[in-house]
């Protein structure tokens, strides 16, 4: 591109015409202030293409850069653009006149910014002040640009002298901004509500000073639109937030939420949803399976735990055998109810130590001005076995017998063995299982007893050896679900003298 | 300051030429921009063609292959040879001259086309 006169800067006078030619090898054209003024295109005979940009009248106004540009860069090897700056002395013109958003002047970091005030003659003297201040701060001045530096956040007005009088510019405002990658959180008061409470969304963006809110919602779909608020934590730096506040929700709001923040200064933005589910009533479900019959061991501490949803909050109540329970002084019964989420609750029923008389009939109730939900099982309390008796007799039959007796929760198995060999056995031989009734050796008589105020069943059972021709240990073996206990007797013949 | 004077118009047929001249007064010592403009009733001052310092001859499209821009550097004078001219070259001519960042116009001369 070739530029006449060449430049970089010319001065010329008010009310005077100038021409600007550029001329190059494909189209060209004239820019002023991102636009195209009024030129005329010519070409010479070499294929030589000019643009001819002829100023007149001339006044302070015409004072600033020019630029010359092929009309069409697409397609040439550089996007060349040739600048002239020219300046019209005008009297009657003081500081050129900014566009508004040329007067605040934001700063995402510390950085040289230019506060751009500039005169028609650069032969004045510019000086910048603080809005507020005389003094003038040392910061180099350049007539085409203005004044650069690094600023704080203050506002600042340039003044310079015309003639005999002092003139000042526009105030300009420089901000520094808090700007960061865009981090959203969304959350409701609730995001169960019933028809006609309110629904009460939150939005909240941290580490930007300015950002666009924009919330999608079921309503605005159908055109009816909600103004959603705007404020900044005051106790929390760069947090603000945009409360959206449907009151007396209908069942159309049920729905997906979303706030989608814009920062415009690098061009970020996330968006976060949440989902608000509108009930035409509260409700109260059980959640999970809990069986009729429960158990517990004796003297173990524990837990029974029933899960379920429900909005609004519900009461719980827990009862035994139909009467009330509560927690107790002595530290034997603890309730609980927990929200686990926002509509989910675990209620905990711990018996400490459990006893006896804890068996029995349980009942859960969770309810509400809206629905209720009841649960129920047995709580059956398991006890060890314990062998209480073993005991041998030779009644005058002529036979041997031994008796053992024992009692557990749930129903103890008895298990008769016997050892022959008492050196060998049990550690060499295993034990030989009696009362099969294949064997007519022994005979087994088993009798089952329900004890109800203990709670627990007992086992008596006899075992009629036929005839023992030498010393027998004999082994009873009580188990239920939670244990075993076993004692031994060892039977000699009649004939011996002696037993052990 | 340089004074230029610009002849040569009048009354011309459709097809027919015309020869403008532009004498300028005083002493030029380089000359940045030459030109002729013109403006039609009711219409802005357009350039017809022009010759930058060291350049070849510009014209618009509307004038190319009719008109010729020349110069005698020994009598201060350009001329602007106007040939099968139309009725819408009708206008007031000017020539103009810069040099450095002054410039000076012609008073214009009228060209009319018409039969």
């Known amino acids: 591109l070739v530029v006449t006169p060449p430049g970089p800067e010319l001065v010329l006078n008010v009310s005077s015409t100038f021409v600007l030619t550029c001329s190059g090898s494909a189209p060209v054209v004239w820019e002023r202030m991102s636009q195209e003024p009024p030129q005329e295109m010519a070409k010479a005979q070499d294929g030589t293409f000019s643009s001819v940009l002829t100023l007149t009248n001339l006044t302070g106004l015409d004072t600033g850069e020019y630029f010359c540009t092929h009309n069409d860069s697409r397609g040439l090897e550089t996007d060349e653009r040739k600048r002239l700056y020219i300046f019209v002395p005008d009297p009657t013109v003081g500081f050129l006149p900014n566009d508004a958003e040329e007067l605040f002047i934001f700063l995402t970091e510390i950085t040289e910014i230019t506060i751009p005030c500039r005169v028609t003659d650069p032969q004045l003297v510019v000086t910048l002040h603080e809005k507020k201040g005389d003094v003038a701060l040392p910061v180099p001045y350049d007539h085409q640009r203005g004044f650069s530096g690094i600023f704080e956040d203050r506002s600042y007005i340039c003044k310079t002298t015309i003639g005999d009088r002092e003139v000042d510019s526009d105030a300009y405002y420089v901000y520094r901004l808090q700007v960061s990658s865009i981090n959203v959180s969304v959350n409701a008061v609730q995001t169960v509500v019933r028809q006609g409470e309110n629904i009460t969304l939150m939005c909240i963006v941290i580490g930007n000073e300015v950002v666009n809110f924009e919330w999608t919602y079921p309503r605005k779909e159908s055109g009816r639109l909600v103004e959603p608020v705007t404020d900044f934590l005051l106790d929390m730096p760069y947090h603000i937030r945009s409360i959206l506040h449907i009151p007396s929700a209908e069942l159309e709001d049920s729905g997906t939420y979303t706030c989608n923040v814009t920062e415009s200064v690098n061009d970020h933005q996330d968006e976060k949803a949440i989902n608000i589910t509108v009930v035409e009533s509260g409700y109260v479900r059980l959640l999970g399976e809990v069986g009729t019959l429960q158990f517990a061991e004796l003297h173990r501490s524990r837990t029974l735990q029933v899960v379920f949803e429900a909005y609004p909050p519900p009461t719980v109540l827990w009862f035994k055998d139909n009467r009330t329970l509560g927690d107790s002084s002595a530290g034997e019964i603890a309730l609980s109810t927990r929200n686990v989420s926002e509509t989910r609750y675990v209620s905990e029923l711990t018996l400490v130590r459990v006893k006896v008389a804890e068996a029995g009939h349980y009942t859960m109730r969770a309810f509400h001005e809206d629905a209720e939900v009841q649960l129920s099982f047995q709580l059956q309390i398991n006890v060890p076995v314990r062998v209480l008796e073993l005991s041998e007799s030779h009644p005058d039959s002529g036979e041997q017998t031994v008796r053992c007796r024992g009692r557990g929760m749930p129903q103890p198995n008895i298990i008769w063995s016997a050892c022959r060999d008492l050196k060998r056995c049990p550690r060499e031989l295993p034990p030989t299982l009696l009362g099969n009734s294949s064997e007519e050796e022994s005979q087994l008589e088993t009798n089952v007893t329900y004890w109800e105020e203990e709670q627990e069943f007992e086992v008596v059972s006899t075992l009629r050896l036929q005839h023992v021709d030498r010393p027998l240990s004999v082994r009873c073996t009580l188990r239920n679900a939670v244990g075993q206990d076993t004692q031994e007797v060892i039977v000699v013949p009649h004939s011996l003298p002696f037993k052990v | 300051e340089v004074q230029l004077v610009e002849s040569g118009g009048g009354l011309v047929q459709p097809g027919g030429s015309l020869r403008l001249s532009c004498a300028a007064s005083?002493?030029?010592?380089?000359?940045?921009?030459m030109g002729w403009y013109r403006q039609a009733p009711g219409k802005q001052r357009e350039v017809v063609t022009f010759?930058?310092?060291?350049?070849?001859?510009n014209y618009v499209d509307s004038v190319t292959g009719r008109f010729t821009i020349s110069r005698d550097n020994a009598k201060n004078t350009m001329y602007l040879q106007m040939n099968s001219l139309k009725p819408e070259d009708t206008a007031v001519y000017y020539c103009?001259?810069?040099?450095?960042?002054?410039?000076?116009w012609g008073q214009g001369t009228q060209v009319t086309v018409s039969s």
């Open positions: 103009y001259i810069q040099s450095g960042t002054a410039g000076s």
């Open positions: 005083g002493s030029i010592v380089r000359v940045d921009f």
């Open positions: 010759i930058t310092s060291g350049g070849s001859p």
